[in-house]
Interface confidence: low
């Protein structure tokens, strides 16, 4: 089928970077400025993506490939092909609808993006807390209390984590 189509359709001879111009007897015309065609046989060229505002250009548009964007400092990409930029927060914070808020007690975030996650509950694995958690770091679990030599002490386990979100910081 593809072979038959290519024999019948002169547009199939137009390579990437051109389009089959119906207004000019189906001649293969180069894509105009700020447009591209990434495959052959196209009847139109696609408009290049413009990286404006909070987006910045990671890769310039060419006649055969679209521009690629990333985000200006202080923001990070979200979605396929960096379709959105989302504000960075500091470690120890999460982005809420009201902006960056500190992680609630019992939760942490060690990245500039994403949500605060509950500290590991060491006791679920039969272990004790070796190093307390912070807003930026998870707790470090140590050996189980039974593994500790007599007289050794462990740090008090953390309180149960609360849901992150509405507590004013």
């Amino acid at each position: 089928f593809e072979r038959t189509r290519s024999l019948q359709d002169p547009c199939s001879n137009c390579p990437a970077g051109t389009f089959c111009d119906n207004n000019r007897n189906q001649i293969c015309s180069p894509c105009p400025p700020n447009s591209f065609s990434s495959a052959g046989g196209q009847r139109t060229c696609d408009i290049c993506r413009q990286c404006k505002g909070v987006f910045r250009t990671r890769k310039e548009c060419s006649s055969t490939s679209n521009a690629e964007c990333d985000c200006t400092p202080g923001f990070h990409c979200l979605g396929a092909g960096c379709s959105m930029c989302e504000q960075d927060c500091k470690q120890g914070q999460e982005l809420t609808k009201k902006g960056c808020k500190d992680c609630c007690f019992g939760t942490f975030n060690d990245q500039k993006r994403g949500i605060c996650r509950p500290w590991t509950n060491c006791s679920l694995d039969g272990k004790s807390v070796l190093v307390n958690g912070t807003k930026e770091r998870d707790v470090v679990c140590g050996p189980s209390p039974a593994d500790l030599s007599p007289g050794a002490s462990s740090v008090t386990p953390p309180a149960p984590a609360r849901e992150p979100g509405h507590s004013p910081q």
């Epitope: 505002g53 909070v54 987006f55 609808k97 009201k98 902006g99 004013p168």
Partner: antibody
Framework: QIQLVQSGPELKKPGETVKISCKAS????????MSWVKQAPGKGLKWMGW????????TYADDFKGRFAFSLETSASTAYLQINNLKNEDTATYFC??????????????WGQGTLVTVSA | DIQMTQSPSSLSASLGGKVTITCKAS??????ISWYQHKPGKGPRLVIH???TLQPGIPSRFSGSGSGRDYSFSISNLEPEDIATYYC????????FGGGTKLEIK
């Protein structure tokens, strides 16, 4: 300094369409969401909704779904409010207001001067 | 939707005096309330955000307090330029303005 400058007053007939603008300057337009607020004569302020200025996604308050449309011209750092099929009760001053917390919610630190829309046969 | 009940709707006070306006939310708004001064023919002006944080350039005669569902806004040592309508705004979940309080000087 940060400024929001709105278009001038409009006199329209019922059933017509109006489109008012809010031109921002002094900051990166696509970094902060833009809300629209209505004040009918002798009444209080009423939040109409907001538009995310980098994704272009609008959110409308329940009372403003249907005839109301928010849009952007990011190259001109301008937000627009369009009201279709105008009714007498649309007579009001409309304000644009910039959120403080990026394209998220937050208090309004910056306001336009308002645009009076009068609907009268 | 969160409702904001603001009272009183109007009040009259003497120069040099003190007034207090209250806003009650229909649910806990976690201190996410701001207060605005609005004069005719102008855009509203932010006075206080996050319950009690004074906006730069606003005199310390203005103050705010509250928690949970109940919040208040006060102006002490009233001056002629304080004549305006004042609004509370919750921004905990979308936005809702209070009904406004028109302040007049006796």
């Amino acid at each position: 300094q940060i400024q929001l400058v709105q278009s001038g007053p409009e006199l329209k007939k019922p059933g017509e369409t109006v489109k008012i603008s809010c031109k921002a300057s002094g900051y990166t337009f696509t970094t902060y969401g833009m809300s629209w607020v209505k004040q009918a004569p002798g009444k209080g302020l009423k939040w109409m909704g907001w538009i995310n200025t980098y994704s272009g996604v609008p959110t409308y308050a329940d009372d403003f779904k249907g005839r109301f449309a928010f849009s952007l011209e990011t190259s001109a750092s301008t937000a627009y409010l369009q009201i279709n099929n105008l009714k007498n009760e649309d007579t009001a001053t409309y304000f644009c207001a910039r959120g403080n917390d990026g394209n998220y919610y937050g208090w309004f630190a910056h306001w336009g001067q308002g645009t009076l829309v009068t609907v009268s046969a | 939707d969160i409702q904001m009940t603001q009272s009183p709707s109007s009040l009259s006070a003497s120069l040099g005096g003190k007034v207090t306006i209250t806003c009650k939310a229909s649910q806990d708004i976690h201190n996410y309330i701001s207060w605005y001064q609005h004069k005719p023919g102008k855009g509203p002006r932010l006075v206080i955000h996050y319950t009690s944080t004074l906006q730069p350039g606003i005199p310390s005669r203005f103050s705010g307090s509250g928690s949970g569902r109940d919040y208040s806004f006060s102006i002490s040592n009233l001056e002629p330029e304080d004549i305006a309508t004042y609004y509370c705004l919750q921004y905990d979940n979308l936005y809702t303005f209070g009904g406004g309080t028109k302040l007049e000087i006796k």
